[in-house]
């Protein structure tokens, strides 16, 4: 067992918008981070994925219960010490997106392009409508590439 000494470690604090805030915290246990002290609070045990602390931990070391995140609205995908779950992503129709995999308590929503929309970047925050061809199609639109159109006056073989 490692000796108890104060060390700095990066620990994830999770806020209610579904976004992580990185804080440098001091831990008493160097091996497994079982004790966590930050913002004047002391947590002994993290909550598992899909749950959050029922309330903030207090200095006197009492251990709040872990309660589930709101199914379909919030999630946490790793063990953490926060009293807040992460907010599920919305797949915004106006950005050409739809839900591919629904949010669960332990996994954020996965979005994809709506039918007849495409996105050619690795991370898709916005999908564009597929081009409609006036003079015929060379290649159909896919989730990752736009339609390729024939030019006016070009012949089909």
């Amino acid at each position: 067992r490692l000796s108890s000494k104060s060390v700095n470690a990066q620990v994830t604090d999770i806020n209610s918008k579904g976004l992580e805030l990185r804080k440098t915290v001091t831990t008493v246990e160097t091996q497994n981070l079982e004790g966590l002290h930050h913002d004047g609070q002391f947590c002994h045990k993290p909550c598992p994925p899909g749950e959050r602390k029922a309330r903030d931990c207090t200095v006197n070391g009492d251990e709040p219960d872990c309660v589930p995140c709101q199914e379909g609205k919030e999630y946490t995908d790793k063990a953490h010490f926060s009293s807040k779950c992460r907010r599920c992503r919305l797949c915004d129709e106006g950005h050409g997106l739809e839900v591919e995999i629904n949010c669960t308590r332990t996994q954020n929503t996965k979005c994809r392009c709506k039918p007849n929309f495409f996105c050619n970047s690795t991370v898709c925050e916005h999908c564009d409508p597929c081009t409609k061809c006036e003079h015929g199609i060379i290649k159909e639109c896919t989730l990752t590439s736009n339609t390729k159109c024939k030019e006016e006056g070009s012949r089909s073989n």
Epitope: N15, S16, K17, G18, L19, E20, L21, Q70, K73, K84, R87, R89, L90, C91, D92, E93, G94, H95, V123, E125, H126
Partner: antibody, heavy 121, light 111 residues
């Protein structure tokens, strides 16, 4: 086009309640969360809370819990915000706004014209 | 709560000049390389109007005289060239953490 039309100005006595409506048109009402924002005279805008019209799930700013109640009537594409136990500090313009999500950044792209609520004895 | 402080309080410029509006957050509003900052314009007696979302994305229908930049705790809205119709109050707003908060506003006057 996308539009949010709010109910008219209200004058209320302290202790009373008021219900402000926000009728949406030009888009699928249940596809976008609705936000509510307060603007008191000479104060910065304050986010009050939000509602998901698809299932009436609500999320409030802690400051407005117990003060504001958000509801929707999906058949009428209308969101409501009720303020209870009115006090002079509730005098403000209240806005509804449509929520958008750009990779978990939530923003308000269309706003109602605002409803002035005046609390006066 | 995350506090947003805007400066200057009032800016007075002539048409054609460059307006630089600042918004500083009390803690970072970034996550995973993205900045959760939005900008709105409000004219007297009107509702706010979205200009910029996610720090630098121009809302559809907004002239490209408007641009947003910044990350972490420091953000800027730039208007160039300024036009008479830009006279308004401009608000920044963060959505990195609940409660979502707004700055106190910068008033832009056109000489």
């Amino acid at each position: 086009q996308v539009q949010l039309v709010q109910s008219g100005a209200e004058v209320k006595k302290p202790g009373a309640s008021v219900k402000v409506s926000c009728k949406a048109s030009g888009y699928t009402f249940t596809s976008y969360w609705m936000q509510w924002v307060k603007q008191a005279p000479g104060q910065r805008l304050e986010w009050m809370g939000e509602i998901d019209p698809s299932d009436s799930y609500t999320n409030y700013n802690q400051k407005f819990k117990g003060k504001a109640t958000l509801t929707v009537d999906t058949s009428a594409s209308t969101a409501y915000m009720e303020l209870s136990s009115l006090r002079s500090e509730d005098t403000a313009v209240y806005y509804c706004a449509r929520n958008r999500d750009y990779s978990n950044n939530w923003y308000f792209d269309v706003w109602g014209e605002g409803t002035l609520v005046t609390v006066s004895s | 709560d995350i506090v947003l402080t805007q400066s200057p309080g009032t800016l007075s410029l002539s048409p054609g000049e460059r307006a630089t509006l600042s918004c500083k957050a009390s803690q970072s509003v970034d996550y995973d390389g993205d900045s959760y900052m939005n900008w709105y314009q409000q004219k007297p007696g009107q509702a706010p109007r979205l200009l910029i979302y996610a720090a630098s994305n121009l809302e559809s229908g907004i002239p490209d005289r408007f641009s947003g930049s910044g990350s972490g705790t420091d953000f800027t809205l730039t208007i160039h060239p300024v036009e008479e119709e830009d006279a308004a109050t401009y608000y920044c707003q963060q959505s990195n953490e609940d409660p979502r908060t707004f700055g106190q506003g910068t008033r832009l006057e056109i000489k």
